[in-house]
Interface confidence: low
Amino acid sequence: QSPIFGPQDVSSIEGNSVSITCYYPDTSVNRHTRKYWCRQGANGYCATLISSNGYLSKEYSGRASLINFPENSTFVINIAHLTQEDTGSYKCGLGTTNRGLFFDVSLEVSQVPEFPNDTHVYTKDIGRTVTIECRFKEGNAHSKKSLCKKRGEACEVVIDSTEYVDPSYKDRAILFMKGTSRDIFYVNISHLIPSDAGLYVCQAGEGPSADKNNADLQVLEPEPELLYKDLRSSVTFECDLGREVANDAKYLCRKNKETCDVIINTLGKRDPAFEGRILLTPRDDNGRFSVLITGLRKEDAGHYQCGAHSSGLPQEGWPVQAWQLFVNEESTIPNSRSVVKGVTGGSVAIVCPYNPKESSSLKYWCHWEADENGRCPVLVGTQALVQEGYEGRLALFDQPGSGAYTVILNQLTTQDSGFYWCLTDGDSRWRTTIELQVAEATKKPDLEVTPQNATAVIGETFTISCHYPCKFYSQEKYWCKWSNDGCHILPSHDEGARQSSVSCDQSSQIVSMTLNPVKKEDEGWYWCGVKEGQVYGETTAIYVAVEERTRGSPHINPTDANARAKDAPEEEAMESSVREDENKANLDPRLFADEREIQNAGDQAQENRASGNAGSAGGQSGSSK
């Protein structure tokens, strides 16, 4: 399929102008290459009429232009003074020859319609209301008034002043006069449908003294707005149907031959194919609303319509707005996992791609909720605190320059299953949808922390160990202290690193962290995790309670600690102030080097983020064993 997109059918009338917009993929080559508009001949040859290289054919001289808009990845062909000879098949395309990338456009130019003299032309969209104005002389002030529709030679009455209404106009047509006006009456026809189009005659009086007016009513199908979007990106349908339907249920549907299948409506209906990737948001009290769809797929391409009706379903004679969505498969947005699986008690690390040109943009992670319209409240982000219920188990790790950030969620429960969105405050096309599936665990977790009853005493030394299996032998192990703006890496000591990898002893693979001396602000959540470079793996979390040195101080069991963590005031969860007077015990120099490197990486981005990069140990009292 060609990645060039434009309007399939363009129609106009003689003497008028048309403006045709063609879309192309946003690449440097495409922005600079030749753009052309050619006419398809019977012999299969496409004769250039105008191109961006400055060529202009004789028949287009003085009446056409081609303008490239590289910032929008579009080019526009304007053609004026149309004649019926312009009817035909055309191509808009890119490339040095007319056989390159193109899109077929059909142009139809029709004659100016001929109406009887003094015909007033009314042009209205489907679903709207027309008010036809009928003038008469004073002599017919008390005579019968009527409106009829021409069908061949006959004129069938639509409505008259005796209160007759044609059944097909029932509840849609009214005849009235305004105020004290004695020379004009009006007919309103609402909920217009295509078959209402045609020539109408309004009449006051009978016989030769009757006053007659001709009215031509044109009922327009909505002209679809073209939307060109990349695979895996997102699209927003902005729907403005007017005040008259402000209180009716709204919907977005997708055209399917003769029907239009509802994708989402404000009554809670939602197509399962869009589960987890759609939001409908009312914009104001005037009936405006928008529908956002993320994670665009090839099969999402097609014709869409929004509308309003009390049933929340498409109804003939109600206003609609239309779009044609093209999904460009030559996407710059990388393919990422759409389903991530985890087990209860375990963890997941979700990689979120973003536009690498926008590394300083703010990153967010939100949980799509299937309320009636769908919504996506932020759970964590750079400069956004972790939401309630996620304290101690959710962190966002930015990796500046890599074009991705990682979100880690641990202590998983089956309630965490659902859809999540990765997003930034920058390029809104780079929104990705992930489905998290959490199953019941069937075996022990890979990472285990001892002691599980983690209570440290102020002023004393406290060591906590994380046991890992041999499969993590070659990966980097770390401890970090969780706070509301991330999980900050601490110096730690890997017991297993000293052994030969050939003889990995499953029971003695330990990475430990020591708090020495323990301070009140050391209380909180700590994570043990594994990673390979910028790729984060499994994590486990433990809450360390800190208590005063008292005789016979009671131990807090881990479940109480977790409960306390949930109730702890937000202030306690914030990062403590930097302390540089900690004991620096003997450390493997390799660990020191790693730590310094991490510290620097963290410092560069320190104030651009509120989540920890695989970040600094500053602000923690952790030192190694």
């Epitope: 997102s234 927003t236 939001l279 948001t281 914009r283 928008s290 956002l292 993320t294 703010l362 967010y364 939100c366 919504r375 996506c376 409240p377 932020v378 982000g381 400069q383 956004a384 605190l385 969105w421 997003l423 930034t424 405050d425 809104s428 929104r431 509301n484 937000e570 202030e571 914030m574």
Partner: nanobody, 121 residues
């Protein structure tokens, strides 16, 4: 659309105080973060302090102990009390608000016009 209006900038002596105020108006549901940034000529805007929707405050090291961020009851006004001002604090101070938009499925960032703070030694 959201508008941010700053006030309170001006000239202060080194060691003196100034109070900056920022009010958000327009279509506001819930402001997730309100912050003050500052910028000196030729440098990028840098964060000074911010307050989150649950009233947790965060200060950069240079602001700790000298600057205090507070928010009005309606949560749409934030004040930055700057004490013990130093010549290095001279800059244009910008108010920043971040508001989650369900409609766009993203966090929208808004900026004020900026207010100039001059510190004479």
């Amino acid at each position: 659309e959201v508008q941010l209006v700053e006030s309170g900038g001006g000239l202060a002596q080194a060691g003196g105080s100034l109070r900056l105020s920022c009010t958000a108006s327009g279509t506001i549901s819930k402001i997730d973060v309100m912050a003050w940034y500052r910028q000196t000529p030729g440098n990028e805007r840098e964060l000074v302090a911010r307050i989150f929707s649950n009233d947790v405050t965060h200060y950069v090291d240079s602001a700790k102990g000298r600057f205090t961020l507070s928010r009005a009851q309606d949560k749409n006004t934030v004040d930055l009390q700057m004490n013990s001002l130093e010549p290095d604090d001279a800059a244009v101070y910008y108010c920043n608000a971040q508001i989650w938009s369900d409609m766009r499925g993203r966090m929208d960032t808004y900026w004020g016009q900026g207010t100039l703070v001059t510190v004479s030694s």
